[in-house]
Interface confidence: medium
């Protein structure tokens, strides 16, 4: 988790002299309780947008949006404490927004907005924003949160952002797979404008089981220059297992940027239908 | 269902040393904050120090900065407050409570556990 770089963190507004800065997440009202403490955030809203920084990379970033209550409460607010929180790994980031100036009630409901968080793809995160001061221990809670899932780099936009371009993101390979005669594989798929290798890992499975019956792993050497884009074409030959018929089939690029964390492909080959056997004819009808 | 049960108190003279511990049960969430608060007779709680277990920042009280030192134990779901220095104003009975956000508004608290420190 980071803030974004490309510029200064504003939240001043007309009517507000605002300040961002840097937070622990451990906003120390609580340690310092006052008697008097704003409502909640309403309407928080989270949504995905993107931003380049000064270096021109494009990131997924958290869009964050919240309203003001129109209650007096408002005379006592302070500022805002952002947190977001990456939900696998426990990772937490926060700023705070410090009112220098009083709000007041004006003819349009407050707004406030931040995107600087830049966000993960295929990541969920939990957002909160709490008003400050925090309330007195035991009080009413003046915080909302939300839960914000980024898409993966499948994503139409996501794909071309820097994070999903560096893991391999606008390389499509057209993966096909075709069953050969004595039990082969014959796997064919397009090859990157990188002399890099890659890694074709093959797991068979039972018709309708999901422990496999199979592995194996078979090198592709870096391609020449002249080959880039060309399709490369394996044949794997299958262990000949009586109802190890499903065939997945991934190819694992190496690529400069991912190294040996690049997106992967896959394809599956299903088993072939069983056709329905007939009842068996008797060889003579009983008389009885 | 969350269970917080603090131990460690008890009397020591001015200038000695005490470590409450705080064991903690129940607890769904993979991350949370926990704080110490102290409650004085006739006086309003108040916090003393707190955690956050995702990546263990802390934060204190200006009244015990430098005497005091919160920490954590995952392996055993354990909060700690370690006291050095002690001073008799900071007898009371001590509390910890855990929090999924940071403002200890809607906490589970343990029974609490007294300190009693003498001049």
């Known amino acids: 988790l980071r803030l974004l770089d490309h510029r200064a963190l504003v939240c001043s507004q007309p009517g507000l002299n605002c300040t961002v800065k840097n937070s622990t997440c451990l906003d120390d009202s609580w340690i310092h309780p006052r008697n008097l403490t704003p409502s909640s955030p309403k309407d928080l809203q989270i949504q995905l947008h993107f931003a380049h920084t000064q270096q021109g990379d494009l990131f997924p970033v958290a869009h964050i949006e919240w309203t003001l209550q129109t209650d007096a409460s408002i005379l006592y607010l302070e500022g805002a404490e952002l947190s977001v929180l990456q939900l696998n790994t426990n990772e937490r980031l926060c700023v705070r927004f410090e009112f220098l100036s009083k709000l007041r009630h004006h003819h349009r409901r407050w707004r406030f907005t931040f995107s600087h968080f830049v966000v993960d793809p295929d990541q969920e995160y939990e957002v909160t924003v709490h008003h400050l001061p925090k309330p007195i221990p035991d009080g009413d809670p003046n915080h909302q949160s939300k839960n914000f899932l980024v898409p993966d780099c499948e994503h139409a936009r996501m794909k071309v952002t820097t994070p999903c371009m560096s893991s391999g993101s606008l390389w499509d390979p057209n993966i096909t797979v075709e069953t050969l005669e004595a039990h082969q594989l014959r796997v064919s798929f397009t090859l990157w404008n990188e002399s890099t290798h890659y890694q074709i890992l093959l797991t068979s499975f039972p018709h309708m089981e999901n422990h496999s019956c199979f592995e194996h792993m078979h090198h592709i050497p870096a391609p020449r220059p002249e080959e880039f884009h060309q399709r490369s074409n394996v044949t794997l030959t299958l262990r000949n297992l009586k109802g190890c018929c499903r065939h997945q089939v991934q190819i694992q690029p190496f690529f400069s940027s991912c190294l040996n964390d690049c997106l992967r492909h896959s394809a599956t080959v299903s088993c072939p239908e069983m056709p329905d056997t007939p009842e068996p004819i008797p060889d003579y009808m009983p008389l009885w | 269902q969350v269970q917080l049960q603090e131990s460690g108190g008890g009397s020591v003279q001015a200038g000695g040393s005490l470590r409450l511990s705080c064991a903690v049960s129940g607890y769904t969430h993979r991350s949370y904050y926990m704080g110490w608060f102290r409650q004085a007779p006739g006086k309003k709680r108040e916090g003393v120090a707190s955690?956050?277990?995702?990546?263990?920042?802390?934060h204190y009280a200006d009244s015990v900065k430098g005497r005091f030192t919160i920490s954590q134990d995952n392996a055993q779901n354990t909060l700690y407050l370690q006291m050095n220095s002690l001073k008799p104003e900071d007898s009371a009975m001590y509390y910890c409570?855990?929090?999924?956000?940071?403002?200890?508004?809607?906490?589970?608290w343990g029974q609490g556990t007294q300190v009693t420190v003498s001049s």
């Open positions: 955690i956050y277990t995702g990546d263990g920042s802390t």
């Open positions: 409570a855990a929090d999924t956000q940071n403002s200890f508004t809607a906490p589970y």
